[in-house]
Structure formats: structure tokens, C-alpha cells
């Protein structure tokens, strides 16, 4: 009996036409929502003039349906037992699951004003930029609608640059009508223990963002893992959102709609400083903001974002060092609300429920030549928004899963 089940599982989790795994893999049967909370700055003038602590108040959720598009350009390579694809991006606003509309306004850091002097650390160019910032009446903070902030707006300061540069700015710009990938993953046909593991991303086995082994693309995309998952296993996965591979460890056993699943959680040491976790030394790529690599809980992903000063953290700076959160008032980190977890059905390795939580922050530094930033007395890692991307297996699918998989084992 057990041998038969194992054989069936091994057959059905292979990523090829006709298997259960393939059908769900091409287009997820799970409805995935991405909720956003925006950090509305309450004291913009005080910060710009006096370098005060930034007072923020989160507003949300604003909910979008995501990952509803099927994978495209799916190509099997029988030679190396891989399948390649791209994942199209799309987001549909869900008013009924949101506290307001996409036209709601927020006071947030001026992304272009903060980023420009970071990209151009040249005193002559900073004088030029200052001229354009003043002419466009831009300042350290700006008021933008949700739609503008997330998906893009024409920046008035960048629009004055007399060269053909991209003048559209947005936290996720460009998103709609773009694709993530190309991913090339093992289909598991020759070796089931490699199924869904990423062989290459964008044609490369490494990211070119990090030194040493930090640059490796490890594991799957977290939608599934090789079958027969044990509690002792560390689940490794790559997240293009955070430009790195990361891992989850067993946390607890959960009953999900009658299906026993293992909840794997991202441990605090994944975000630790090299002092606490020497394995993280290659994620510390600069010495100043990181206080000589002693700060923790924030990841500088600038190299992956064309040099823009983007930092990723957990929401409300959960598991971050006090020096990171000290200049910000109004944050309330909470393990339950702000941690990331994956609920994995251990026999198949399918992720049946997940919550991916992350926060997007922008570094803003004092800049003597830029009047909008010249009164700052310290750098700030400014929270812009945090997101909660969730998916849960539907009731119908859960019943089907119980009948076909867990029921048979019992």
C-alpha cells in the first residue's frame, strides 16, 4: 500500500503535462491576495526642517488580487529534465477587501528626491539636481495616491532632466504587463527530490547581486517543494521580490481544512547580522548604514534595483535592530501579524497556504547640496509600505486533496 502511494505521489508531483502538480503549477487554483498598508507620515515638515523622528501611521489594508495569470512560454527540456517559464505579473484592485479606494492620498517620502543624491554622489551633479528639485517645487515628502505610489506616476523633478530618462516612479513600477523570469526548474522526471528546484533564473545560476554564496539561487519558488517533507528539513527558496534566496524551518503542525500540514517559518536568524549569524556576512555589502555590519533586520537590495536605495525588512521592522527602528515612531512589530510562513503538505510538498510579509523602505541621507535634504542630521531608513501576500487552498480543492492524497494514506 505505502509503496503504491509513494509511487503515485512520485508520478503526480512531476512537472509535466497530465499530472496533478502540473495543472496547479501552470495556473494556481488558489486565490492569492496582496494586501498593502501604507505608512502615512504625520510630521513631514518637522522631519525636513529639524531632522525629527518620523511619525508614521499605517493605513490599510488595500487589497489586490495577484498571481491569477497562468505561467507562459512553458518549455520542457527532456535533455536536462527541466521546464522553463515566465510568470506574468498582474494586480486587480479589490474594493470590497480594502479600507478605501486607489485614489486615497498618503504623505510619503519623495522617492526621486531621496534616491537621486544616493545614485549621484557627486557634488557638481547634486547642485544640478538641487536646481531641478527647486524648480519642480519638490520636497523631501510628497502626497501621492495609492495607485500612483504603487504602480507609478510621472515625477515632476525627473521630468526636468533634459535627457531621455525614465521619469515614471513607483514602488512596483513597472508591474502590470511585465513578467518575472525566465525561470528554469527541474521537472523531477529523473529525480523527484529535485522537482521544482530552480536550475537558473534569467538564464543565470547566480544573481550577480551579492558576493560569495549569498548570490546563489537556492531551492524552489516556495509554491511547492520536493515531496516527503520532514520536519528536520530546511526549506530553501528564492524570492525575486527580495532579490535573494532564503529559508524556512519547521514551526508547528497545523490542521488546514482537515489536511495535516507543516507550518514552516522564516527564522529570525535569516535576518540577523553577521555578528549573530556569520552565514549572513555576504548580505552586508556596505559598512556605514549597517554600522559596520552590526545592524540587522534590513537588507540593502540597491544592487538589484539599479542602485536605488531600497531596503527590505519584515513589517514594522520585526526582528530588526533598535538603531533601525529608533528614528521611526508608530511601529508595532508583532510576530503573528508580521512573520512569513508556509504551510506545506508533507507528502506532496505542495504549499497549501502561505503568508508572505515584507516591508519596502527607502534610505534617505543628508545631502549638503540639496536644500530639501540639507537639514537632516542622520540617515533614515524610511518605511514606505508593507505587504501581506496570502493564499489558501479552496474548500473544494481541499476536499479533493483529502480524498486523493491524505485520505488514501489514512
Amino acid at each position: 500500500g505505502d509503496m503504491l502511494i509513494e509511487k503515485t505521489i512520485k508520478r503526480e508531483v512531476v512537472l509535466e503535462e497530465g499530472t496533478t502538480a502540473f495543472k496547479n503549477w501552470v495556473k494556481t487554483g488558489t486565490t492569492v491576495y496582496r494586501q498593502f498598508w501604507i505608512f502615512d507620515v504625520q510630521n513631514p515638515d518637522d522631519v525636513a526642517k529639524n531632522s525629527s523622528k518620523i511619525k508614521v501611521k499605517q493605513r490599510g489594508p488595500y487589497t489586490y488580487r495577484v498571481r491569477y495569470l497562468a505561467k507562459e512560454n512553458i518549455t520542457q527540456d527532456p535533455e536536462d529534465h527541466t521546464v522553463s517559464f515566465v510568470q506574468p505579473n498582474g494586480a486587480i484592485f479589490e474594493p470590497s477587501l480594502s479600507v478605501g479606494t486607489e485614489d486615497d492620498n498618503f504623505t510619503v517620502l519623495n522617492l526621486a528626491v531621496a534616491a537621486a543624491p544616493h545614485i549621484y554622489q557627486n557634488s557638481f551633479v547634486q547642485v544640478v539636481l538641487n536646481s531641478l528639485i527647486k524648480k519642480s517645487k519638490s520636497s523631501m515628502f510628497q502626497t501621492r495616491s495609492l495607485k500612483e505610489l504603487l504602480w507609478g506616476y510621472k515625477d515632476p523633478f525627473l521630468s526636468l532632466v533634459p535627457y531621455p530618462i525614465s521619469t515614471t516612479v513607483g514602488v512596483f513600477y513597472p508591474y502590470n504587463d511585465t513578467v518575472d523570469g525566465v525561470y528554469k526548474v527541474f521537472n523531477g522526471k529523473d529525480n523527484i527530490s529535485k522537482v521544482a528546484i530552480i536550475e537558473s533564473y534569467k538564464g543565470k545560476r547566480n544573481l550577480s547581486y551579492w558576493p560569495s554564496y549569498c548570490d546563489m539561487i537556492n531551492g524552489t519558488d516556495a509554491a511547492s517543494f520536493p515531496p516527503f517533507v520532514e520536519k528536520s528539513r530546511t526549506l530553501r527558496f528564492f524570492s525575486s521580490d527580495i532579490c535573494r534566496s532564503i529559508y524556512a524551518v519547521f514551526g508547528s503542525e497545523i490542521d488546514l481544512k482537515g489536511i495535516p500540514v507543516y507550518r514552516f517559518v522564516l527564522p529570525a536568524n535569516a535576518f540577523a547580522s553577521p555578528l549573530q549569524n556569520p552565514d549572513n556576512h555576504c548580505f552586508c555589502t556596505e559598512k556605514v548604514i549597517s554600522n559596520n555590519c552590526t545592524s540587522y533586520g534590513v537588507l540593502d537590495i540597491g544592487k538589484c534595483k539599479e542602485g536605488k536605495p531600497v531596503y527590505i525588512s519584515l513589517p514594522h521592522f520585526l526582528h530588526a535592530s533598535p538603531d533601525v527602528s529608533e528614528p521611526i515612531e508608530g511601529l508595532h512589530p508583532n510576530e503573528d501579524e508580521h512573520r512569513t510562513y508556509l504551510d506545506v503538505e508533507p507528502i506532496t510538498g505542495f504549499t497549501l497556504q502561505f503568508a508572505k510579509r515584507l516591508q519596502v523602505n527607502i534610505l534617505v541621507k543628508p545631502a549638503r547640496k540639496i536644500e530639501a535634504l540639507k537639514n537632516l542630521k542622520r540617515p533614515y531608513i524610511v518605511p514606505i509600505l508593507w505587504l501581506n501576500e496570502t493564499g489558501t487552498i479552496g474548500d473544494e480543492k481541499a476536499e479533493m486533496f483529502k480524498t486523493q492524497v491524505t485520505g488514501k494514506i489514512k
Partner: antibody, heavy 117, light 107 residues
Framework: EVQLVESGGGLVQPGGSLRLSCAAS????????IHWVRQAPGKGLEWVAW????????YYADSVKGRFTISADTSKNTAYLQMNSLRAEDTAVYYC??????????WGQGTLVTVSS | DIQMTQSPSSLSASVGDRVTITCRAS??????VAWYQQKPGKAPKLLIS???SLYSGVPSRFSGSGSGTDFTLTISSLQPEDFATYYC?????????FGQGTKVEIK
Amino acid sequence: EVQLVESGGGLVQPGGSLRLSCAASGFTISSFGIHWVRQAPGKGLEWVAWIAPYGGYTYYADSVKGRFTISADTSKNTAYLQMNSLRAEDTAVYYCARSFFGYFDYWGQGTLVTVSS
Amino acid sequence: DIQMTQSPSSLSASVGDRVTITCRASQDVSNWVAWYQQKPGKAPKLLISYANSLYSGVPSRFSGSGSGTDFTLTISSLQPEDFATYYCQQHSNLPLTFGQGTKVEIK
């Protein structure tokens, strides 16, 4: 086509004044800003003055500070260099040049200023 | 002020030669260095910006390299029209400053 044409050079006595003009076409001077660079006979290039984009700021080399004034008339798309209290060492070919990121991609043909008694 | 020191101040070379001119900045200017060519009685012409970015229309035999304080302009195979004076310039800080020039003459 981008073009810069200087005019206004000539012979002037020490202590005298002169106003150089730089007429631009093919681009808007206010978007880029304009620099003046000079070259004494048989010598190298020396940066003199700059009016930043949108005329918000002006900067000068120490050697001319307080004596020279750079300005622009956006309606005429023309930049000017007003030179007062001229000295013999100000004798040079004066070029106006376009720049945004600090390197000069277009130059005028130059106008000669001779300060001599 | 940032001093730009060019060497040599002059050199003699033949058509087809590989020519290298160096420029040293008195402090770190990252890659904010431009190179110009000037012929007698004419305005300078931009060859290279950002230390190594060839300006449009400039022949590919010209190349620039370097970062920080040491920079090089290379002409891979000298042509008759390349006999001129070459200047480096830092565009990192005000005042903008030039090297004293390198005159490339026919041997």
C-alpha cells in the same frame, strides 16, 4: 542641431568692462545651464563660470569672483558674461559650453578678449 | 580645488602607434572624468565622459579607463587626424578643473 555662438569679444583696457553673449539654438539653455571656459594664448583650458539649470545658482572660479557675472535671458535663449575690472591675465579666447552632468558636450567657436593698454 | 595632472605634457608618435595619456586627480573623483581633443584655433571636442563612455560619433579607437584618482586615455592606432592636444577634466566637484594638456605630435 545644437549650436552655440559667442560674440562681444575685443580689445579693452585694463580696468575696463566687456559683455560677452552666447546665443544658443537647438536646445533650451534653462534646461541645461551654461558654462564659460577660457584659454589664454598658448595655454590650457580654465573653467570660469556656470549658470545652473533654471538660473537658480551661479558659480565662479576664484580668479574672477566679484568681477565677472554670468546671467541668462531665457526669452532670447542667450547667456551672458559681464566682465568688469579686467586685467591683462584675463586675455584669452572665451568659449561658452553646454553641460548638464559637468562634461561639455557642445562648445561655441570662441571669442577673443584682449586686455591691454 | 581638485588638481588634474596630465602626463606626458607632449609626445611624438607615428601613424598606427598606440598612444596612452594619463591623468591623475589630487583626490577621488570616482569615474567623473571627461577627455577632450583640441586642434589649433578650434574649440575642444568631447571624446569621453564618465571616464570610459565614448561620446557619440567618436571613433572607437579612442577609449578611456580608470576610477578614483588614476585615468587613462588610449588611442589604439593613431591616425593623421589625431595629432592634437588632449585634455582631461574632472566633473565631480566645483570648480571644474582641467589637466594642463598633452600635445600629440608627429614623429
